[in-house]
Amino acid sequence: SWMWNQFFLLEEYTGSDYQYVGKLHSDQDRGDGSLKYILSGDGAGDLFIINENTGDIQATKRLDREEKPVYILRAQAINRRTGRPVEPESEFIIKIHDINDNEPIFTKEVYTATVPEMSDVGTFVVQVTATDADDPTYGNSAKVVYSILQGQPYFSVESETGIIKTALLNMDRENREQYQVVIQAKDMGGQMGGLSGTTTVNITLTDVNDNPPRFPQSTYQFKTPESSPPGTPIGRIKASDADVGENAEIEYSITDGEGLDMFDVITDQETQEGIITVKKLLDFEKKKVYTLKVEASNPHVEPRFLYLGPFKDSATVRIVVEDVDEPPVFSKLAYILQIREDAQINTTIGSVTAQDPDAARNPVKYSVDRHTDMDRIFNIDSGNGSIFTSKLLDRETLLWHNITVIATEINNPKQSSRVPLYIKVLDVNDNAPEFAEFYETFVCEKAKADQLIQTLRAVDKDDPYSGHQFSFSLAPEAASGSNFTIQDNKDNTAGILTRKNGYNRHEMSTYLLPVVISDNDYPVQSSTGTVTVRVCACDHHGNMQSCHAEALIHPTGLSTGA
């Protein structure tokens, strides 16, 4: 039978001779050289050689356990004379014995990690891991211990796990954001002579809201014209916050002051500024200075830092309103005046009033816009605003006069305003009634008495309050012995009636009737109009057949016998 123990071979042999492994031996071996030992399997004849006479095995090369920890070979013992095996072919193992020839290697050359600033001591940051290729089952060659070479007193590492934790209280990102920590992994349980490897851990402190907003100055002053419409931005204020991102977001609000209702503050999300805007119309004449208390606050607050104080700050904003010179303001948007058409020149119609709304109350002068009164019918007292006539009026020519009055500040002619004046001319009975048309009528020679031969109508340019009331009559000089009569219908019309039976056209072919038309107004106005009556030959139906044309060439006036 075979006689051997398990073979062990130390790795990384550095001697000049071959490294002795062990001896294959059969109890059949007499020592007379009759047996021949043969080696086969892993590395046989190359890595491992055998003395075929003695069975001594040697390693020809330096071996690395980490490359191959075990070699499996087969041994044979053969009788040289017969060539027959004296022992059954048997498998044996050469185990490579570990030495500490490998340092620990970290899984990453550089680790990156983050941890919130102001974290409690012992807060987990990251775990680093190093591996050692040496044999973990034999000795301490692969027993790794972690330690911190750089990064104290800020961070610590657990020696067995490689867990990095915070080691310092109140680490403040605003003071320092980046840390480079160097961790060593050492084998042999960290003992002297152990091999080591290092890695770098780049740790960034992430922001927490541990800083309130702060105004760089306690007071701000802005000025704005009183004419600024609501929504006008008048100034920007900015509080600074040492935090970043969401933690540095700021909301602005007006918390106090006389300007609480007059101004707004809006937050510019891009610049984190507070924009003070006009909320209501300002009036320099009412208030010239406003004081606001503006607050800047963090909308995202971490309760655990509230002990640091309120996460807000206040500043005083003083807003000064600038005077804008405003034009005079008339007491009315428009004026309606009236005057009788018989008014004498220089008659006062009424007056306008305008006042400078500015606190200075600059005096105002008045004038008529001559483009609206080309004929210079009206004038105005530049001092008191009295409107008066400068020409005679005629309602029948123009009933309404639309003119514009200008008020101008004496100290500042650029400041002026205008107002429309509507002047109504009131009627006076200054026109006589007259015929509505030229009347030329005809009478048949065989006409009967009291026949209506013409209806008369009158017109009057005047416009009496109670309407027209005209009366018609024959002129006194024609009233007696007239061949015709006038019948006043009392409805502003009159009829011409025949007064006799029959007319002779050869005796009198044309009659001229003077008719007096009067109105009923005060003072009474009347006029005389002439009606021409021609005598015509008519058939038995009363249709005119012929009329003399003499009437066309008769002189104006009364014909005899009318």
Epitope: T219, Y220, Q221, E285, K287, K288, R318, A359
Partner: antibody, heavy 122, light 106 residues
Framework: EVQLVQSGAEVKKPGASVKVSCKAS????????MHWVRQAPGQGLEWMGW????????EYNQKFQGRVTITADRSTSTAYMELSSLRSEDTAVYFC???????????????WGQGTLVTVSS | DIQMTQSPSSLSASVGDRVTITCKAS??????LAWYQQKLGEGPKLLIY???TLQTGVPSRFSGSGSGTDFTLTISSLQPEDFATYYC????????FGQGTKVEIK
């Protein structure tokens, strides 16, 4: 030429009141802010308040609030500063000064009165 | 409230000297600063406004500079009539004066 002429020196007892006048000429009185500034003996200048003669609006330094009253008479173009409940530390020269900006309650002072010495002594 | 600190509080100089007076504001007042000269028994006289603008009629030897919180009044060549007390004044928010700098003959 702008001129601010102030009333003469006054001697007052503690607890009394004093009224200093400042007559303006050479500009439109109603269009500029009129400020009052005082200067205690050997001391610096201290702003007291302003009035806008156009409409009589005023603003006072908090330190003097309740004790100082500034008024203006437009008909005579005169501004007045009245200080009540006088104490010895109110002994000072009181100046009126025109605010440079018409229609703006800010700015510097371009013309000053010659000053009125008010002495408070028992 | 904004405080104004003037320095020096007094200085001695000779005719022809270059004189510099400084004024510091407790917060940013931009260019809202005026300089005044006051002689004994008189009211102050405006020299400079808006930090560096010379008031009409004031000699060009007076100049002002600065912005924000730090300001300077310079008299390039001191004249006999320049011996007086100088005040700075902020008008950014309300009105406040420095405590004054007395310029005396050396």
């Amino acid at each position: 030429e702008v001129q601010l002429v102030q009333s003469g020196a006054e001697v007052k007892k503690p607890g009394a009141s004093v009224k200093v006048s400042c007559k303006a000429s050479g500009y439109t009185f109603t269009r500029n802010f009129m400020h009052w500034v005082r200067q205690a003996p050997g001391q610096g200048l201290e702003w007291m308040g302003w009035i806008y003669p156009g409409d009589g609006e005023t603003e006072y330094n908090q330190k003097f609030q309740g004790r100082v009253t500034i008024t203006a008479d437009r008909s005579t173009s005169t501004a007045y500063m009245e200080l009540s409940s006088l104490r010895s530390e109110d002994t000072a020269v009181y100046f009126c000064a025109r605010g440079v900006y018409g229609g703006f309650a800010g700015g510097y002072f371009d013309f000053w009165g010659q000053g009125t010495l008010v002495t408070v002594s028992s | 409230d904004i405080q104004m600190t003037q320095s020096p509080s007094s200085l001695s100089a000779s005719v022809g000297d270059r004189v510099t007076i400084t004024c510091k504001a407790s917060q940013n007042i931009y260019k809202n600063l005026a300089w005044y000269q006051q002689k004994l028994g008189e009211g102050p006289k405006l020299l400079i406004y808006d930090a560096n603008t010379l008031q009409t009629g004031v000699p060009s030897r007076f100049s002002g500079s600065g912005s924000g919180t730090d300001f300077t009044l310079t008299i390039s060549s001191l004249q006999p009539e320049d011996f007086a007390t100088y005040y700075c004044q902020q008008y950014y928010s309300g009105w406040a004066f420095g405590q004054g700098t007395k310029v005396e003959i050396k």
